[in-house]
Interface confidence: low
């Protein structure tokens, strides 16, 4: 290729090129100058650049760099944002279906427990949704509350239907008895284990995806240092000062400059790698009781089994509770 | 045992959101995401090279700019970058990351620690024969992973957890509605031997 033309005496080439960056302003010297005030594009001879032009080049270089960085991360950012949204929605759908299954189980198998059961189930699954989204709720408390609420209804509707409409005092006694007598056997503990493990993993999975977005957003909107701006200006624009419009930076030189500008960002690399590998490990383990889809969609069956367990032991329980909550019942009959 | 109800499927259409492919499950979608993320595992270390390859750089030209002058692309001067007497590249690296980058690194360290803590230990319940016996409440061992709900008679103590329901209720329309005898292909995302 022929060597580029020397800078023209009138700085015409440089001026017409610079006008594209900064229309209207007469910052380009009429003729090449010594350029002793320049800080970045230190000339070996006369130059067609001024201090003001240098500053504009630095600003443009940093903007270019930010745009390049954003386009570099666009695919990755879209991947995580899209998946975070899809999974969040999918998890909400799973919760909704799990609630529907559970409600249908009550409707089909224990119609006398509705609509109270619907209300308790609704509250439970609302808490599940909130927990997944990061609310500070204790899963054990959620499960306990579900069974505490269900038992008085089961007792008064299924085990002892002769009782008048339940009053608050017997309900409180029954709630207490529920735990003391382990009326549902080990089912509440089982559900606590399965639900807490699966929801913890789901929650951390969503948290991790959202942090992934935050990482990309952070590096996406980095403001590059003045030093970096100067290096970029030297690489991309200082050649213009000599009228060398068509030449491109040397490849090795570009890599050195970018590594300098990206030194801070590249420090994320180690933790980013670990993030992806740790996320992979988590995902590989998201099965059995660590898979909320599996656990929640099967919950109706376990709750059904727990009620059957109560019914199986109804005779023994009714006697024991009769004694335990006798005081409450007497007050209720008055 | 309780069965999948048929009268409360109000979400069938919206349910398909989680299915890009017709038989896709949440579990396969997660694995697909990880595979795609893994292609970005070197994203940050590769950034300098990526940006150079996406900005104007001399590739086929004989001459290139080294920051000070026009040089032959394969000469010693092309690699040297004329930064002497200006700002030291080493100093630039020694400054350390921006506060905002340090902050995000701390968050990554934290989430990585959480992810490692939460990761399920491998191979704990394999290669044991499934042996089950009825048990009373309180009979479920210290390891709650080993307890699953039975389908009626109390619960089961299971030495090997062997089930996995990897469906987002997708094939409920065909498979799980009671009394349905349609001809259909069984979904392989049913329960499976290892995942309960």
């Amino acid at each position: 290729q022929p060597p580029p033309p020397p800078p023209d005496a009138t700085c015409h080439q440089v001026r017409s090129f610079f006008q594209r960056l900064q229309p209207g302003l007469k910052w380009v010297p009429e003729t090449p100058v010594p350029g002793s005030d320049l800080q970045v594009c230190l000339p070996k001879g006369p130059t067609c650049c001024s201090r003001k032009m240098e500053e504009k080049y630095q600003l443009t270089a940093r903007l270019n760099m930010e745009q390049l960085l954003q386009s570099a991360s666009m695919e990755l950012k879209f991947l995580i944002i899209q998946n975070a949204a899809v999974f969040q929605e999918a998890f909400e759908i799973v919760v909704r279906h799990a609630k529907n299954y559970t409600n249908a189980m009550f409707k089909n198998n224990y119609p006398s427990l509705t609509p109270q059961a619907f209300e308790f189930v609704g509250e439970f699954f609302t808490d599940v949704s909130l927990y997944i989204l990061g609310s500070d709720i204790n899963v054990d408390d959620m499960v306990n509350e579900l069974f505490d609420s269900l038992f008085p209804v089961i007792y008064t509707q299924l085990m002892n239907p002769g009782l008048p409409d339940s009053a608050l005092d017997i309900n409180e006694c029954l709630r207490g008895a529920r735990r003391d007598l382990k009326v549902f056997g080990n089912f509440p503990k089982l559900i606590m284990t399965q639900v807490s493990k699966s929801l913890q993993v789901t929650r951390i999975f969503l948290q991790a995806l959202n942090l992934g977005i935050e990482v990309i957003n952070t590096t996406d909107h980095l403001k590059f240092s003045k030093d970096c701006g100067r290096m970029l200006t030297r690489m991309w624009y200082c050649s213009y000062c000599q009228g060398l419009m068509m030449v491109k930076p040397c490849g090795g030189y570009c890599n050195v400059v970018m590594q300098g500008c990206m030194a801070g960002v590249v420090e994320i690399d180690k933790y980013w790698r670990e993030y992806i590998l740790s996320l992979e490990e988590l995902v590989n383990g998201m099965y059995r009781i660590y898979d909320m889809e599996n656990v929640l969609l099967g919950l109706f069956s376990t709750i059904h089994d727990s009620i059957q367990y109560v019914q199986k032991n109804a005779g023994k329980l009714t006697t024991t509770i009769g004694k335990l909550c006798a005081h409450s019942q007497q007050r209720q009959y008055r | 045992s309780a069965y999948y109800p048929e009268d409360l499927f109000i979400d069938k259409k919206v349910l398909k959101v989680a299915h890009v492919e017709h038989e896709e499950t949440l579990s396969s979608r997660r694995r697909e995401l990880i595979q795609k993320l893994k292609s970005f595992i070197s994203f940050y270390s590769a950034l300098p090279g990526y940006i150079c390859s996406h900005s104007p750089v001399a590739e086929n030209d004989t001459l290139c700019w080294n920051g000070q002058e026009l040089v032959e692309r394969y000469s010693q001067k092309a690699a040297r970058n004329g930064m002497k007497n200006q700002f030291n590249l080493h100093e630039l690296k020694m400054k350390g990351p921006e506060p905002v980058v340090s902050q995000i690194i701390d968050k990554l360290k934290h989430i990585n620690q959480l992810l490692r803590t939460m990761s399920v230990p491998k191979g704990r319940v394999l290669d044991k024969n499934l042996d089950e016996e009825g048990f009373e409440s309180g009979d479920c061992g210290d390891d709650e992973d080993e307890c699953i709900g039975g389908s009626g008679d109390g619960m089961m103590k299971v030495k090997n957890q062997l089930r996995f329901l990897a469906e987002l209720a997708y094939d409920l329309d065909v498979d799980d509605v009671p009394g349905n005898n349609q001809q259909a292909t069984p979904k392989d995302n049913e329960i499976s031997t290892f995942h309960n």
Epitope: N284, Y287, L297, G298, S301, T302, D305 | S1, A2, Y3, Y4, S28, R31, K122, G123, L126, D127, N129, L130, E132, I148, G149, G150, S151, G152, N160, L162, R163, L165, D175, D176, N181, T185, P186, K187, D188, N189, E190, I191, S192, T193, F194, H195
Partner: antibody
């Protein structure tokens, strides 16, 4: 189309080992368990074990008391079943089958054990 | 291990007549997710087994509608409404809920 293609027939001496392969195609190998079932001449079907290629998890029929090892190579979408300390009663056709319901089976591999 | 018991072991049938095979499991095959994991297979002479019915009553694609499955818990039945010559072979029931998975001894269907 899902296909499972097994390795050819083998003749082995008692005490030796045999390794049967099953190459899968037409689906994502890592996503589905591969099971192994055998059938002695004129006899019924007997489940031997399974592997989940994605996680490497395995499950075995304890009747084989550690003689069977099932592995999978994700890069070639191939599952393997190795049976060691062969005896004459191990003479059978060995099938691989994809879970769930074994809707897809290999063509079978005849393993003959004789002195 | 769960024992799967099939009856009869041999079933001579006249073409066009119905046939019925029974399968009993030593334990309930109902899983806690509500599904019952019982399958029926047909193994034609010299071939690999082929799936007919999964989850008690669901016909696999391509299986003629003369085949139907029924039952619950521990007792299951495979019915062929009108036997055809191509239906000869050994029929197996199988459970895939407890490891080790097990099969019935097989029922040999032959044309009289």
């Amino acid at each position: 189309e899902v296909q499972l293609v097994q390795s050819g027939a083998e003749v082995k001496k008692p005490g030796a080992s045999v390794k049967v392969s099953c190459k899968a195609s037409g689906y994502t190998f890592s996503d589905y368990e591969m099971h192994w079932v055998r059938q002695a001449p004129g006899q019924g079907l007997e489940w031997m074990g399974a592997i989940h290629p994605g996680s490497g998890d395995t499950a075995y029929n304890q009747r084989f008391k550690g003689r069977v090892t099932i592995t999978a190579d994700k890069s070639t979408s191939t599952a393997y079943m190795e049976l060691s300390s062969l005896r004459s009663e191990d003479t059978a056709v060995y099938y691989c089958a994809r879970f769930y319901s074994y809707a897809y089976w290999g063509q079978g591999t005849l393993v003959t054990v004789s002195a | 291990d769960i024992v799967m018991t099939q009856t009869p072991l041999s079933l001579p049938v006249i073409t066009g007549e119905p046939a019925s095979i029974s399968c009993r499991s030593s334990q309930s095959l109902v899983h806690s997710n509500g599904n019952t994991y019982l399958q029926w297979y047909l193994q034609k002479p010299g071939q690999s087994p082929q799936l007919l019915i999964y989850k008690v009553s669901n016909r696999f694609s391509g299986v003629p509608d003369r085949f139907s499955g029924s039952g619950s818990g521990t007792d299951f039945t495979l019915k062929i409404s009108r036997v055809e010559a191509e239906d000869v072979g050994v029929y197996y029931c199988s459970q895939s809920i407890y490891v080790p998975y097990t099969f019935g001894q097989g029922t040999k269907l032959e044309i009289k």
